[in-house]
């Protein structure tokens, strides 16, 4: 994970608190899930590597009418508030596999927890 702070520069990275807040929101979503999350909507899976936050946003934004993940979408926007320039991290739009939103959230949560435990905030 080379640039948590978006794509403007590889400079400052999000403080651990911001990462923790995002983790807590994802935990809330998974714990409060009763019916299929977002009616079982499918989203593109992403590479959990550089540019992960913006990639996650670009994938989840395609889910409409699902209030359960709107806060997550807005929090992900905190990491990359301005659009990625064409050509930057082209992997953002590599689209080969679709998974359910619920699985996407679980995968993202597991990865973020791992990063948090390892202190990998940059």
């Amino acid at each position: 994970l080379t640039c948590l702070g978006g794509f403007a520069s590889p400079g400052p990275v999000p403080p651990s608190t911001a990462l923790r807040e995002l983790i807590e929101e994802l935990v809330n979503i998974t714990q409060n899930q009763k019916a299929p999350l977002c009616n079982g909507s499918m989203v593109w899976s992403i590479n959990l590597t550089a540019g992960m936050y913006c990639a996650a946003l670009e994938s989840l934004i395609n889910v409409s009418g699902c209030s359960a993940i709107e806060k997550t979408q807005r929090m992900l926007s905190g990491f990359c508030p301005h659009k990625v320039s064409a050509g930057q991290f082209s992997s953002l739009h590599v689209r080969d596999t679709k998974i359910e939103v619920a699985q996407f959230v679980k995968d993202l949560l597991l990865h973020l927890k791992k990063l948090f435990r390892e202190g990998q905030f940059n």
Partner: antibody, heavy 118, light 111 residues
């Protein structure tokens, strides 16, 4: 309730400097990007600067190199350091919570007035 | 820079009638099928307030009388029916390309 309170505006001579502050409350400040947007005397709105939750900054060419946006996540304060001020920088400056390019400027403060005049 | 042209500059509408405001962009503001166009309301003496994001999504707490439509370069904000409290200036804003830009505003008055 989300609250954004700007301060630091005033009258400054061309070429001078000024530092604006914005105290945020009612949301997890550290988790959101923030921006400054100004409104000219002619009521035109102009985006001035943005900062991500991680501290990456974004500026239009009109202020790049003259203005610096920063944040103090411990105190929930957003700043705008303005230097080499010009008459065209005269405006009402608003602090806004930026929910990203997909959601726009979700919350705005009441603004602080900056007048650049000799 | 993307130029946003709003029309009309001002309009007067009777209470209970429909108000339609147009915003035209000098180039497309769509990103992978999502229109990065937002609408704000600014009442006299107040700061702007987000009404609509991504062309047609109603921000939380905004009455359903407000609606947005459009894609690529042509966008519309509709208020139906208009109420006295809607007297304000309305602005469109694009976030598809830096620098982010706003339209010149449309002032809504009651006839």
């Amino acid at each position: 309730e989300v609250k954004l309170v700007e301060s630091g505006g005033g009258l400054v001579k061309p070429g001078g400097s000024l530092k604006l502050s914005c105290a945020a409350s009612g949301f997890t400040f550290i988790s959101y990007a923030m921006s400054w947007v100004r409104q000219t005397p002619e009521k035109r709105l102009e985006w001035v600067a943005s900062i991500s939750s991680g501290g990456n900054t974004y500026y239009p060419d009109s202020v790049k190199g003259r203005f610096t946006i920063s944040r103090d996540n411990a105190r929930n304060i957003l700043y705008l350091q303005m230097s080499s001020l010009r008459s065209e920088d005269t405006a009402m400056y608003y602090c806004a919570r930026l929910d990203g390019y997909y959601f726009g400027f979700a919350y705005w403060g009441q603004g602080t007035t900056v007048t650049v005049s000799s | 820079d993307i130029v946003l042209t709003q029309s009309p500059a001002s309009l007067a509408v009777s209470l209970g009638q429909r108000a339609t405001i147009s915003c035209k962009a000098s180039e497309s503001v769509d990103n992978y099928g999502k229109s990065l166009m937002h609408w704000y309301q600014q009442k006299p003496g107040q700061s702007p307030k987000l009404l609509i994001y991504r062309a047609s999504n109603l921000e939380s707490g905004i009455p359903a009388r407000f609606s947005g439509s459009g894609s690529r370069t042509d966008f519309t904000l509709t208020i139906n029916p208009v109420e006295a409290d809607d007297v304000a200036t309305y602005y469109c804003q694009q976030s598809n390309e830096d620098p982010w830009t706003f339209g010149g505003g449309t002032k809504l008055e009651i006839k």
